[in-house]
């Protein structure tokens, strides 16, 4: 007789997870070298001993801690992207701007990202039919936790100028119940981070709006000058443009604005 | 069985450009980096580049940058090396490589090589 | 980058003799240097990986030691097999680099 399972409301955990993980923590320390003192098989037991055979509602930021010291990492603390609903552009950028570093360019972040993970109570199984939603179920599950935790001591690393790219096509630019806006914002340092400078990104071709008047900015603005951080804010109205500039600065296209 | 094969020879002219292939089969390509390396007729081994299949991300020796573009396809498990601009210098074969799981950060696994001529 | 000197650039060995090839890199790289054999018209071979690890299947004639910027890579008995050409590398800082290759012979 089939053992019940609970049912979640979100996907379950991604196919082939344990060796994607694996996978990838060897990717990172062949591209990474730096990183090379790392043992992958150990990243892993790591990783799966914050979530196995733990209720899927019930995970803490101490329950990542093996898996977070393991993946001690120093990025240049003045370096840091942070993003917020645009993702896939930062991602573009630093792979362009190789001096720059999302949470993503991480090895933490590389391993996780866009996987969904999640075990049950008192089994060592992984469940691959259903996870718990954020929304619908609870906000302490296995996915949720690690990115708060991992965002956290990003955010808390960062110093001097931190830049954060926004997309200027939603109805919220800045988000508070974002990673950026519920976590990021209120981990930066004060005492080391000087300026938090906004990007927001255009989508539209034609528009030209200054998005930096845009009342959600403006409560980050407000959010950011409270805690003793400055505040700066441009539009990129051509992403494309942009882009193809930090490629080709010299290029003669690129002293207009982008 | 893990295998890496590659397109045929190549003939160009200088000015050209020259697009490699490097289909792989025995395992998850996504799960390994793919590197490109350079040999000329008779001479050593130069490391080109690499790429993540599964991001595309890429990274080119200071040599190689703005000549060569690495790519690769996800739904054909192929990585593609680009030279562009070629000149008689190019002559050379050009494998795909990469690690393993027992073999610290040396490259167990290679193409059979493709030879591209480069010659007016 | 990182320069991986290789000497000799050839030598020629009686069958059964020790051969031993050294490679020298112009910074430490710790124990990430590689070893490979090419013969000719064939893709290199994985022999050593780590300095001194032999790669599955390799002969325990092929051996190789050193680690910081000294390295050594031994073939124990020479065999009519091993006429090939063999190049040490260095993984450990990007861009990875070839030595210059040392050609074997039989006398």
């Known amino acids: 007789v089939p053992r019940w399972r609970q049912q979640w409301s979100g996907p379950g955990t991604t196919k082939r997870f344990p060796e994607t993980v694996l996978a990838r923590c060897v990717k990172y320390t062949e591209i990474h070298p730096e990183m090379r003192h790392v043992d992958c098989q150990s990243v892993w037991d790591a990783f799966k001993g914050a979530f196995i055979s733990k209720h899927p509602c019930n995970i803490t930021e101490e329950d990542y801690q093996p898996l977070m010291k393991l993946g001690t990492q120093t990025v240049p603390c003045n370096k840091i992207l942070l993003w917020s609903r645009i993702k896939d552009l930062a991602h573009q950028f630093t792979q362009v701007q190789r001096d720059m570093f999302t949470l993503e360019d991480t090895l933490l972040g590389y391993l996780a990202d866009d996987l969904t993970w999640c075990g049950e109570f008192n089994t060592s199984k992984i469940n691959y039919q259903s996870c718990p939603d954020w929304r619908k179920d609870c906000s302490n599950n296995p996915v949720s936790v690690f990115w708060k935790t991992v965002s956290r001591r990003f955010a808390e690393a960062a110093c001097d100028v931190v830049h954060v790219m926004l997309n200027g096509s939603r109805s919220k630019i800045f988000d508070k119940n974002s990673t950026f806006g519920s976590v990021e914002v209120h981990n930066l340092q004060p005492e080391k981070v000087q300026t938090l400078e906004a990007w927001v990104i255009h989508g539209g071709r034609e528009d030209s709006r200054d998005l930096c008047q845009d009342p959600t900015i403006k409560e980050l603005e407000s959010i950011i000058s409270k805690r003793n951080i400055q505040f700066s804010c441009k539009n990129i109205y051509r992403p494309d443009k942009f882009l193809q500039c930090v490629k080709n600065p010299e290029d003669s296209s690129c002293t207009s604005e982008i | 069985e893990v295998q890496l094969v590659q397109s045929g020879a190549e003939v160009k002219k200088p000015g050209a450009t020259v697009k490699i292939s490097c289909k792989v089969s025995?395992?998850?390509?996504?799960?390994?980096?793919m590197n490109w390396v350079q040999q000329h007729p008779g001479k050593g081994l130069e490391w080109m580049g690499w790429?993540?299949?599964?991001?595309?991300?890429?990274d080119v020796a200071e040599k190689f940058q703005g000549r060569v573009t690495i790519t690769a396809d996800t739904s054909t498990d192929t990585a593609y090396m680009e030279l562009s601009s070629l000149r008689s210098e190019d002559t050379a074969v050009y494998y795909c490589?990469?690690?393993?799981?027992?073999?610290?950060?040396?490259?167990?696994?290679w193409g059979q090589g493709t030879t591209v001529t480069v010659s007016s | 980058d990182i320069q991986m000197t290789q000497s000799p650039s050839s030598l020629s060995a009686s069958v059964g003799d020790r051969v031993t090839i050294t490679c020298q890199a112009s910074?430490?790289?710790?124990?990430?240097v590689d070893w490979y054999q090419q013969k000719p018209g064939k893709a290199p071979k994985l022999l050593i990986y780590?300095?001194?690890q032999r790669y599955t299947g390799v002969p325990s004639r092929f051996s190789g030691s050193g680690s910081g910027t000294d390295f050594t890579f031994t073939i124990s008995s020479l065999q009519p097999e091993d006429i090939a050409t063999y190049y040490c590398?260095?993984?450990?800082?990007?861009?990875?680099?070839f030595g210059g290759g040392t050609k074997v012979e039989i006398k």
């Open positions: 490589a990469r690690t393993g799981y027992n073999s610290g950060y040396g490259f167990p696994y």
């Open positions: 025995g395992y998850t390509f996504t799960d390994s980096v």
């Open positions: 790429i993540d299949p599964e991001y595309g991300r890429t």
């Open positions: 910074q430490n790289v710790d124990s990430d």
């Open positions: 780590k300095a001194s």
């Open positions: 590398a260095q993984s450990n800082t990007h861009p990875r680099t």
